[in-house]
Amino acid sequence: IVLRPSRVHNSEENTMRALTLKDILNGTFSYKTFFPNWISGQEYLHQSADNNIVLYNIETGQSYTILSNRTMKSVNASNYGLSPDRQFVYLESDYSKLWRYSYTATYYIYDLSNGEFVRGNELPRPIQYLCWSPVGSKLAYVYQNNIYLKQRPGDPPFQITFNGRENKIFNGIPDWVYEEEMLATKYALWWSPNGKFLAYAEFNDTDIPVIAYSYYGDEQYPRTINIPYPKAGAKNPVVRIFIIDTTYPAYVGPQEVPVPAMIASSDYYFSWLTWVTDERVCLQWLKRVQNVSVLSICDFREDWQTWDCPKTQEHIEESRTGWAGGFFVSTPVFSYDAISYYKIFSDKDGYKHIHYIKDTVENAIQITSGKWEAINIFRVTQDSLFYSSNEFEEYPGRRNIYRISIGSYPPSKKCVTCHLRKERCQYYTASFSDYAKYYALVCYGPGIPISTLHDGRTDQEIKILEENKELENALKNIQLPKEEIKKLEVDEITLWYKMILPPQFDRSKKYPLLIQVYGGPCSQSVRSVFAVNWISYLASKEGMVIALVDGRGTAFQGDKLLYAVYRKLGVYEVEDQITAVRKFIEMGFIDEKRIAIWGWSYGGYVSSLALASGTGLFKCGIAVAPVSSWEYYASVYTERFMGLPTKDDNLEHYKNSTVMARAEYFRNVDYLLIHGTADDNVHFQNSAQIAKALVNAQVDFQAMWYSDQNHGLSGLSTNHLYTHMTHFLKQCFSLSD
């Protein structure tokens, strides 16, 4: 059981207050983290509270301002980037969000040597992506879907691509589906380690069907937003990878990297690019049917002025029980010999572990093993490998950082974080300086988050970077709910759950229960992290019990649980939520007449199916921006888990797993359906179809749309949303306002 933070004595309880909805909406109890912007082995940049950009040297203990807040303010800069030669800084302003990661901005280049902005050959605006080379001060940027190169900030640009066209050809930036479902970045270009070469992806969306929706704005006529968006089974983007020599860009121009023959024989994806050296690059490809991935190591042939990807350097990763990888196929971390690498993939027992590949995947040496999973490889040095896992004390929802000594034999393993602040910190990530000389640990909970700086050789804590003292003081007079993380064993399945209990929880009483669900493949909701959010308020002020359950399809507990949902989404995720609810009822403190479920996105899909399960367990529920049919969602995501919506593949389950097919079953529940009309991700179409099916079945329901809002329902919509959902739940649970 995790109690957080440490409770004060009962005598003080009368001075304490419950959380309010206003607290949540105002972000009163939000926390800060500190991620150093490393610029060398022992130096990092950080933006101070007063917006100066400060350089810290860990070894000398000195710090100095490299860029004043005055300079930042002169162009309204919200972000910055120092060139590796430390001669220039780009300043980013006029941030304009596009999709999840992408945005456009205006960029100014500031010359640190003379304290002036670079004049002449200024950058065009708005720019879609801009970055420095890893060495020196070359610039690559994307403008109007084409890539440009500058040898120095003041130089005229060299145009690398010419075929870029809005919604048609994307160079150096991903299209919608690659951004959201494959790369998870706003960029699709990669500098080689010393800046000799620039690799980039070209996405051709010419034949992709377009999703069109109205953006109402405040003009007389609404605008139509058009996005090439491949839904399940539709035509996909065509991807090509090119590499250009940035020293002699005009010599032979961009050279295409060949696609492995076994991949090129049918529809495929490019999944990631990793530079190994300036003349060796590693590309990962994936068949459209995403159970076969090929990692291809390519070498620059100076005599060809292009890239050679010999078959002997192709490594195949195949899943026979599900899809390749977890959410994404893992990326390799190369060792110092520049050919062997470390990679996370399933072992023979079906747990994701670190393997060392020297020649072939078949001869891979397993580095970690056990009934737990390695989650991320942070850094490989000459003698150490740093990774995170959920091994410690067998809690899948924890993350600790480990170091394996690879320089000695046999390799020894040390948990760097397990015993640092054991009660407060059980969920870590890390950020390493060059050569892992130093690293920052960021602890997300379950106690109040804290960020610390450590010596990379001894693991000794050097200093606290951020401990959220103000938050700690602010919470002293707040009655926070209690949280516990436990597991249920049901039919050989382990269901981990997090329960959030009212501050004066009494097992002999009965409480309304709200299930919060996400449940998407390879997700995890039950995590040992700190949060003061809407459900904290519902427990603290409104006396609800809230539960989160990780059922089949969720991550980091082995392939058996993860791949259980393969090709049949919408079945076991729902069953496991229902099973858990029944178990919670058996615990004796749940009022079985007051049980609700809510979820957003995939969670909206699961909550809708749970409400329509016909069990009679749920009195009411909310679906925010739900998927309603897998035929409406993106090809890359959907087909990974469901295959294709064709007769000879999996069309039958596509049809059987829709929310609309269960419209009749909503008759005996109170259903609140919510969606943003400008949702580029889960299209409003999904909720429109649910509503239509419910109307056709003459089933009463409640609905709320948010005009011109996307999948995040941000800004004022957030306040309205949570206020509206609160009223709905209080009404459902007969709680007075």
């Epitope: 010599y251 100076e302 005599d303």
Partner: antibody
Framework: QVQLVQSGAEVKKPGASVKVSCKAS????????IHWVRQAPGQGLEWMGW????????KYAQKLQGRVTMTTDTSTSTAYMELRSLRSDDTAVYYC?????????????WGQGTLVTVSS | EIVLTQSPGTLSLSPGERATLSCRAS??????????MHWYQQKPGQAPRLLIY???NLESGIPDRFSGSGSGTDFTLTISRLEPEDFAVYYC?????????FGQGTKLEIK
């Protein structure tokens, strides 16, 4: 027009060294690789290696590694090939050849050849 | 190393006839994008001259009676109508792997 002009014939004793030059004109010398190929009397062609004058990258045939050195002087647009510890079977015509821009290993312009005779 | 075997060793034909020269590699010299096979002509006392690069691309300035074909391990140089100046030694060369290698040559002589 592109031209590669090589130095004159040489007669060397076994164990000695020879340095053949190849002066390029009519194109940007730093952009194209220069290959060296030899041909023993009445025999076929044997590739010896290449040098990229722009980047300084070099690739030697394994067989000659340790005995051959290829260099360039970009100020005079000249490539050099030095072969040490000469043996009688090194007697051959030595050619420099320019790497074709699009040929990916094809040699589009050749020097006139330099006959090196190794004889005691 | 990749061994290139040319056949026939000698080919005796008359002007106006069609010549077909073959070159077989001990392993593939092609990728999905390109065939790293090239053809040269050499006349006595002269340096070789590039005819075909990338298995089938005609070098500029070379008459179009010369053509190349093939991929993988089997390649062909064809001269559609022999002219008197075409009688020479022809070499194939691969640049797929180091070391670059040449075939032993096919001597095309007047019948």
């Amino acid at each position: 027009q592109v031209q590669l002009v090589q130095s004159g014939a040489e007669v060397k004793k076994p164990g000695a060294s020879v340095k053949v030059s190849c002066k390029a004109s009519g194109y940007t010398f730093t952009e194209n690789i220069i290959h060296w190929v030899r041909q023993a009397p009445g025999q076929g062609l044997e590739w010896m290696g290449w040098i990229h004058p722009g980047s300084g990258a070099i690739k030697y045939a394994q067989k000659l590694q340790g005995r051959v050195t290829m260099t360039t002087d970009t100020s005079t647009s000249t490539a050099y090939m030095e072969l040490r510890s000469l043996r009688s079977d090194d007697t051959a015509v030595y050619y420099c050849a320019r790497h074709g821009g699009t040929g990916r290993g094809a040699m589009d312009y050749w020097g006139q050849g330099t006959l090196v005779t190794v004889s005691s | 190393e990749i061994v290139l075997t040319q056949s026939p060793g000698t080919l005796s034909l008359s002007p106006g006839e069609r010549a077909t020269l073959s070159c077989r590699a001990s392993q593939s010299v092609s990728t999905s994008a390109y065939s790293y096979m090239h053809w040269y002509q050499q006349k006595p006392g002269q340096a070789p001259r590039l005819l075909i690069y990338g298995a089938s691309n005609l070098e500029s300035g070379i008459p179009d009676r010369f053509s190349g074909s093939g991929s993988g391990t089997d390649f062909t140089l064809t001269i559609s109508r022999l002219e008197p100046e075409d009688f020479a030694v022809y070499y194939c060369q691969q640049s797929r792997e180091y070391p670059y290698t040449f075939g032993q040559g096919t001597k095309l002589e007047i019948k």
